[in-house]
């Protein structure tokens, strides 16, 4: 039961995380105009990975796409790439994990196959989360660098009278969405990997061996458990310490090396 819960929760957390990564990637507010220590402006600037926008006090908003590929900063291209890789890996991970879910029966798929798929999707989620966190962090670092550079030469005096204010940008909402979403995807991936360990079948699952003793015909069937006597008892490879209770995990499943007390 715990394995199913862990796997299911890992899937849901990853799903939310990947939805968040997609949302962050599409959002326009990766960087927003810093209004601190600035004259009160009727025009507010913000920028995303794909376009920059200007919102006027009147409510009028104008957005312009970055219609160039080569003219964009390499760092921005890198962030775009990281976010897209994160989304693609996450999407594939979600697809794989759907089939790996223990609560979903697909033909006669063995638990070992489901365990492998769970592990694969878990690793994909982890890498996806790391890509998103890395992408957002690279962008944040770029913002911090530019912020302090523009602060250093914020006011360029012209004859002592005219001032040209350089627009400074600070962290936008998308960065926080991206960090949280990347973190959730990462956590979901770790949960899937943990669930995988619980799904993996017992490695030393020997077939029954018959021993012919003189005068008696006794079949010796090792249960594969420390607590088992191995003499006819626990012949169905069930845990003998559960007081007869049957969990959903135990029905039609092999014992796992992780099922020890």
């Amino acid at each position: 039961m715990a394995v199913t819960a862990c796997q299911g929760l890992g899937f849901v957390v990853s799903l939310i995380g990947i939805a968040g990564i997609i949302a962050a990637t599409c959002m326009d507010q990766w960087s927003t105009q810093d209004l601190y220590n600035n004259p009160v402006t009727a025009v507010f600037n913000y920028q995303g990975l794909w376009r920059s926008c200007v919102r006027e006090s009147s409510g009028f908003t104008e957005c312009r796409g970055y219609f160039t590929l080569l003219g964009l900063p390499a760092m921005l291209q890198a962030v775009r790439a990281l976010m897209i890789v994160g989304i693609v890996l996450g999407a594939i991970g979600l697809l794989v994990s759907i089939f790996a879910l223990k609560c979903i029966r697909i033909g006669s798929m063995e638990d070992s196959a489901k365990a492998n798929m769970t592990l694969t999707s878990g690793i994909m989620f982890i890498v996806s989360g790391l890509c998103a966190i890395a992408g957002v962090s690279v962008f944040a670092n770029m913002l911090v660098t530019n912020f302090w550079m523009s602060t250093a030469n914020m006011y360029t005096g012209m004859g002592g009278m005219v001032q040209t204010v350089q627009t400074r940008y600070t962290f936008g909402a998308a960065l926080f969405v991206g960090w949280v979403a990347g973190g959730l995807t990462l956590i979901g991936g770790v949960m899937m990997c943990i669930a995988c360990r619980g799904l993996a079948p017992e490695e030393t699952n020997y077939k029954a061996v018959s021993y012919h003793a003189s005068g008696h015909s006794v079949a010796y069937k090792p249960g594969g458990f420390k607590a088992s006597t191995g003499f006819g008892s626990n012949t169905k490879n069930k845990k003998i310490y559960d007081g007869g209770a049957r969990t959903e995990d135990e029905v039609q499943s092999y014992p796992s090396k992780h099922d020890y007390v």
């Epitope: 004259p39 402006t41 009727a42 600037n45 920059s52 200007v54 009147s58 312009r64 005219v162 204010v165």
Partner: antibody, heavy 118, light 113 residues
Framework: QVQLKESGPGLVAPSQSLSITCTVS????????VHWVRQPPGKGLEWLGV???????DYNAALMSRLSIRKDNSKSQVFLKMNSLQIADTAMYYC????????????WGAGTTVTVSS | DIVMTQSPSSLSVSAGEKVTMNCKSS????????????LAWYQQKPGQPPKLLIY???TRESGVPDRFTGGGSGTDFTLTISSVQAEDLAIYYC?????????FGSGTKLEIK
């Protein structure tokens, strides 16, 4: 056609308050901001404040303490209230529609004359 | 507050002549986000309210004759009337529409000889 029309008391005693109404027609009142601008006799234009389409306001900081702008969407009216009037507040008061995407105020009312005198 | 300085304060020209008036802002009115200058020009004829002539420093409002041209960027702006007509007798104001409070220049009075 787009129109804005101001109506005010004309004469106000010093230290009294001023209330002017701007009635608009010919455009969606909930899509445009309305500004208030005044012009003392023989002088230049001074921006007083604005009420945006959503109802939020921005004021000239120099007059903020005695200025208030509100609106009634159902009547398509904007109201300007100014307290503690002085002789220096004698001016022509205009309401003007915000350009909304254009820069500036694209349609102006004819204005209403306010004289502060005892 | 942003100070808008207009020059000259008045000028007198003959009909048909070209005239240029200037407006200088104490701070750049060019917004880097959309490369738009938040400056407007108004014409106020005697006894009338102001009328929007030019917005965004260089875009003519609909119905405005093409003899009116706006130019400049950042802090320095110009309004040019290529061939002055008798009906152009008015005071011309520039306005900052970028920073609060929105401020107007003191105006340039155009007189016809």
């Amino acid at each position: 056609q787009v129109q804005l029309k101001e109506s005010g008391p004309g004469l106000v005693a010093p230290s009294q308050s001023l209330s002017i109404t701007c009635t608009v027609s010919g455009f969606s009142f909930t899509s445009y901001g309305v500004h208030w601008v005044r012009q003392p006799p023989g002088k230049g234009l001074e921006w007083l404040g604005v009420i945006w389409a959503g109802g939020s306001t921005d004021y000239n900081a120099a007059l903020m303490s005695r200025l208030s702008i509100r609106k009634d969407n159902s009547k398509s009216q904007v109201f300007l209230k100014m307290n503690s009037l002085q002789i220096a507040d004698t001016a022509m008061y205009y309401c003007a529609r915000d350009g909304h995407g254009k820069v500036g105020f694209d349609v102006w009312g004819a204005g209403t004359t306010v004289t502060v005198s005892s | 507050d942003i100070v808008m300085t207009q020059s000259p304060s008045s000028l007198s020209v003959s009909a048909g002549e070209k005239v240029t008036m200037n407006c200088k802002s104490s701070q750049s009115l060019l917004n880097s986000g959309n490369q738009k200058n938040y400056l407007a020009w108004y014409q106020q004829k005697p006894g009338q309210p102001p009328k929007l002539l030019i917005y965004g420093a260089s875009t003519r409002e609909s119905g405005v004759p093409d003899r009116f041209t706006g130019g400049g960027s950042g802090t320095d702006f110009t309004l040019t009337i290529s061939s002055v007509q008798a009906e152009d007798l008015a005071i011309y104001y520039c306005q900052n529409d970028h920073f609060y409070p929105f401020t107007f220049g003191s105006g340039t009075k155009l007189e016809i000889k």
